[in-house]
Interface confidence: low
Amino acid sequence: VGSGMGTGQRAGSPAAGPPLQPREPLSYSRLQRKSLAVDFVVPSLFRVYARDLLLPPSSSELKAGRPEARGSLALDCAPLLRLLGPAPGVSWTAGSPAPAEARTLSRVLKGGSVRKLRRAKQLVLELGEEAILEGCVGPPGEAAVGLLQFNLSELFSWWIRQGEGRLRIRLMPEKKASEVGREGRLSAAIRASQPRLLFQIFGTGHSSLESPTNMPSPSPDYFTWNLTWIMKDSFPFLSHRSRYGLECSFDFPCELEYSPPLHDLRNQSWSWRRIPSEEASQMDLLDGPGAERSKEMPRGSFLLLNTSADSKHTILSPWMRSSSEHCTLAVSVHRHLQPSGRYIAQLLPHNEAAREILLMPTPGKHGWTVLQGRIGRPDNPFRVALEYISSGNRSLSAVDFFALKNCSEGTSPGSKMALQSSFTCWNGTVLQLGQACDFHQDCAQGEDESQMCRKLPVGFYCNFEDGFCGWTQGTLSPHTPQWQVRTLKDARFQDHQDHALLLSTTDVPASESATVTSATFPAPIKSSPCELRMSWLIRGVLRGNVSLVLVENKTGKEQGRMVWHVAAYEGLSLWQWMVLPLLDVSDRFWLQMVAWWGQGSRAIVAFDNISISLDCYLTISGEDKILQNTAPKSRN
């Protein structure tokens, strides 16, 4: 894999006028260095909510029973090792995948200190060859590992308990000005290694970032739980090139991947090779019919492919985004070598089917042709593959540059970091965090509905066993119907003998209404998959309606919107389960159940098992929520 990147590439296409000599700076400007970094920013609100919801004040619980916090930054070793090439003591070759067991093996390097973070307001982790060797290879003779990890437990633990502001961690290539293009190649390898932040907060009993498989199972009422977060790009890592477009003239290693892998000059196998034009001239490789020697012949290096049989060879771009309809692929190929093979370009969008890019040739001088194909503006990040399919016994292909042009209008949308959260059951089953504390037992022993849920702030998790849990009514006159917490004791409700929030709408001469208001909830984290879950039931005949209203406290003004409504209902006497997405809630909010009924109404309206998903406060979707498909999910 040629995973470096050229920065100062040739301007213009080889087809038009004398090309400039390629030039690459030895070191990067501050802005360019920033573009080589992978930045993790955990918002301050996450810290506030994690502290409030999961970490009780230390005075109220014994030290031994206090939840613990851990953190690490993990990278896959394979792309980093490929950059270094084979090294002594590595027990699997850099080009081949790690053995299966390496998936779980990791070596942990020391992360940054709290002192550093407090002083600089961000932690910068620099990754260079030495750290890669230490983290992925280790002492000679030891097996290579699959994961390189930086231990950030001390730092995360401090930040989540005592820190202020957001947590900023920047991972970047170590700064060394010795070798041309080195930082760029290292940056590409870092991105390919899918860096991710791992956080864990666990109550009494759990003790590692690994999956807890062989753990004793405490009783469900024991305060034991284990939450894990992974922060990573919500799309495969985008090349920093995607902000500027990609232009690769093969004079320096480029941020492209080659299949079969790129070979150096000494290796004569049938694969892509980078060769200087002078050598090609000496070998008469590019002497097509009528080709003349010229000072306008492309200088520098290009790719040559010498194939022996029917085969397929590919050049693959890094992940890109396009914010312009004018985004185009341009590839310069030597046309006299083409009759024995052909080029096919494919657009490979993330999570979508590949589609072909129609290539239009623009003939240039001295046998070179520029093939251009329109990419446009795909919705998702994408890669572009250029395949050369040879169709004879011997085939030659030469490529002088590969460019993705006009792909950005201003700044690209860039990638979005997602903070994915999960709950680990005692037996190792991993649930999405939203499945915890939802009154549905997903863990084998029910620990996802245990003590942790009952310790949440008032109103977050309510089955009305202990009263109204924060739901209140205005001052009531003695004759006004009111919401009550009591059991539905009745032969038809054998399955539901616990308490519920009830309203009895008896026959009245005039219309009546009754409102009950929840406790106030904090503003959900922006673009969290926030949901309200509850059971509801209407028994009898309701001549009227019941609404659930969400009221936001927007800068002192109260703004209400109806999120659920049922009208003129002949109750089935069945409990129905409902999940309501709470989208676009940006302020503190509360809920109101409003019932209105008129003459002839004889119904009981009941609500139970009301919960606000922990996702609202502890999960970040990578992409902003799109306001669609927001109808409540309902089931009996």
Epitope: R103, S211, T213, N427, H440, D442, W577, K633, N636
Partner: antibody, heavy 120, light 107 residues
Framework: QVQLQQSGAELVRPGASVTLSCKAS????????IHWMKQTPVHGLEWIGT????????AYNQKFKGKAILTADKSSSTAYMELRSLTSEDSAVYYC?????????????WGTGTTVTVSS | DIQMTQTTSSLSASLGDRVTISCSAS??????LNWYQQKPDGTVKLLIY???SLHSGVPSRFSGSGSGTDYSLTISNLELEDIATYYC?????????FGGGTKLEIK
């Protein structure tokens, strides 16, 4: 092609145990979970549980906890289910199936089925 | 557990007919539903996953639809090889549960 080959029919005495096997071929064994199903005329198809051959992690239907023990051997690409303390209620056809982690949650390949008869 | 109910336990139809098999869940399952075909010899095949996605290699005469608690499998042009028992299965909650099956026979 992709196959899940199950062991042959078993006739066992009440109170005994039996181990059924499911040998995978034609795909990378550790890329898929193996799930087990029970089929009887009375209760139809029931999901017993699953094992991740890569990690050995398991999840069970509460109903079959203690009744079924799932294991897997990566080296032979074989999954096993041990059924304990057998009674006539355990007489059934048992299927192993595979389920890809990254996919929607479906069983795309099913084994041939093993008939277990519990009788004295 | 979520109960899956296939109200019609057996169904007779003629070759070329359009046949619909229904399945209902005891609570909403958010389209997390698959359909399987079991031949008389016991062979089981996946037909449809996630309510309406056709599994590879399955003829296009099979289609699925539904939402909430009610789902259906449709065979648009019944062929002899479609004689089998059809099962729905939900994967919204653990344990994954199946319907009782609908046996399809030729008139």
């Amino acid at each position: 092609q992709v196959q899940l080959q199950q062991s042959g029919a078993e006739l066992v005495r009440p109170g005994a145990s039996v181990t059924l096997s499911c040998k995978a071929s034609g795909y990378t064994f550790t890329d898929y979970e193996i799930h087990w199903m029970k089929q009887t005329p009375v209760h139809g198809l029931e999901w017993i549980g699953t094992i991740d051959p890569e990690t050995g992690g398991t999840a069970y239907n509460q109903k079959f906890k203690g009744k079924a023990i799932l294991t897997a051997d990566k080296s032979s690409s074989t999954a096993y289910m041990e059924l304990r303390s057998l009674t006539s209620e355990d007489s059934a056809v048992y299927y192993c199936t595979r389920c890809y982690y990254g996919s929607s949650w479906y069983f795309d390949v099913w084994g041939t089925g093993t008939t277990v008869t519990v009788s004295s | 557990d979520i109960q899956m109910t296939q109200t019609t336990s057996s169904l007779s139809a003629s070759l070329g007919d359009r046949v619909t098999i229904s399945c209902s869940a005891s609570q909403g399952i958010s389209n997390y539903l698959n359909w399987y075909q079991q031949k008389p010899d016991g062979t089981v095949k996946l037909l449809i996953y996630y309510t309406s996605s056709l599994h590879s290699g399955v003829p296009s005469r099979f289609s699925g639809s539904g939402s909430g608690t009610d789902y259906s499998l449709t065979i648009s042009n019944l062929e002899l090889e479609d004689i089998a028992t059809y099962y729905c299965q939900q994967y919204s909650k653990v344990p994954r549960t199946f319907g009782g099956g609908t046996k399809l026979e030729i008139k």
